[in-house]
């Protein structure tokens, strides 16, 4: 059972969709650019991305601080139950913008802005990222991270936008964890029905990479659930 708005939207967002992404950024002053493309099934909650560092490679910091900006930011691919309005799918064809602050436990800060649009039947993502204050001997600059644990983003409406909050955990090579508090504001470019509060359960994996992480492939599975749902499904 889908609403009229979501029915109309299914004509715009197909069962299978591609995307292109361009990121420009700097981390502790090191400037870089990344180009990528991806594909996935928006109504099933799965997507893959192939990404290439086109300027500034090899990167002198851990890829893991970039990976969520391509996937956790590719929100049209989140599976939603019929009774939760899919705010970000409904924003198309106009699309949406988002901005994010990631505060890491050692004082590192990453800010991200992203513009999502639809051109010729493909999603187009323009991303800007800035990372500062990462200690030179810390896990990011020493490349000691080993990917993100599965996480749950708490979504809620506020001031005409959709807010997301996550406590994210990076796995470390020594077996420990490195934590980040992540806050994102998503805003459609046109008036769209906002959902109530719910959770998006997310699992992001690096599926392949070359030795210096200048070519990386990622896979993500993401599903919206009422606030009581667990994360077991992500591991199936």
């Amino acid at each position: 059972m889908v609403s009229k708005g979501e029915e109309d939207n299914m004509a715009i967002i197909k069962e299978f969709m591609r995307f292109k992404v361009h990121m420009e950024g700097s981390v502790n002053g090191h400037e870089f650019e990344i180009e990528g493309e991806g594909e996935g099934r928006p109504y099933e909650g799965t997507q893959t991305a192939k990404l290439k560092v086109t300027k500034g490679g090899p990167l002198p910091f851990a890829w893991d601080i970039l990976s969520p900006q391509f996937m956790y930011g590719s929100k049209a691919y989140v599976k939603h139950p019929a009774d939760i309005p899919d705010y970000l799918k409904l924003s198309f064809p106009e699309g949406f913008k988002w901005e994010r602050v990631m505060n890491f436990e050692d004082g590192g800060v990453v800010t991200v802005t992203q513009d999502s649009s639809l051109q010729d039947g493909e999603f187009i993502y323009k991303v800007k990222l800035r990372g500062t204050n990462f200690p030179s001997d810390g896990p990011v600059m020493q490349k000691k991270t080993m990917g993100w644990e599965a996480s749950s983003e708490r979504m809620y409406p506020e001031d005409g936008a959709l807010k997301g909050e996550i406590k994210q955990r990076l796995k470390l090579k020594d077996g420990g964890h490195y934590d980040a508090e992540v806050k994102t504001t998503y805003k459609a470019k046109k008036p769209v029905q906002l959902p109530g509060a719910y959770n998006v359960n997310i699992k992001l994996d690096i599926t392949s990479h070359n030795e210096d992480y200048t070519i990386v492939e990622q896979y993500e599975r993401a599903e919206g659930r009422h606030s009581t749902g667990g994360m077991d499904e992500l591991y199936k």
Epitope: K97, W98, E99, V101, N103, V109, T111, T113, D115, K128, R130, T132, E158, D159, G160, A161, K163, K183, T185, Y186, K187
Partner: nanobody, 121 residues
């Protein structure tokens, strides 16, 4: 180029309220932030509150629950509503603006006002 003009500062009793205003003129980037900072004698300039173009808010721990930042887009004005003020809130308050990356979570805003004095007695 963005110009910022603050107003609303003055003398206020402890426990009282005050509303600061900042009128902005000029063009803004697609992702921007407006912020209030403050500086008291002998101390560094510190973030009080920031508001982004998409509506994200960022408050200093010391003012959470007491101060509210808001924007009236039609008037190009950002406000700082200060409630339940105390002596530690005495400072020169600066309005600032800039790109989201420089001004929302960092102190490197592109544009600054001249400042308005707030004194709590």
């Amino acid at each position: 180029q963005v110009q910022l003009v603050e107003s609303g500062g003055g003398l206020v009793q402890a426990g009282g309220s005050l509303r600061l205003s900042c009128v902005a003129s000029g063009s803004a980037p697609s992702f921007f932030a407006m912020a209030w900072y403050r500086q008291s004698p002998g101390n560094e300039r510190e973030l009080v509150a920031a508001l982004s173009s998409l509506g994200s808010t960022n408050y200093a721990d010391s003012v959470k629950g007491r101060f509210t930042i808001s924007m009236d887009n039609a008037k190009n004005t950002v406000y700082l509503q200060m409630n339940n003020v105390n002596a530690e809130d005495t400072a020169v308050y600066y309005c600032a603006a800039g790109d989201f990356h420089s001004c929302y979570a960092r102190k490197s805003c592109d544009y600054w006002g001249q400042g308005t004095q707030v004194t709590v007695s």
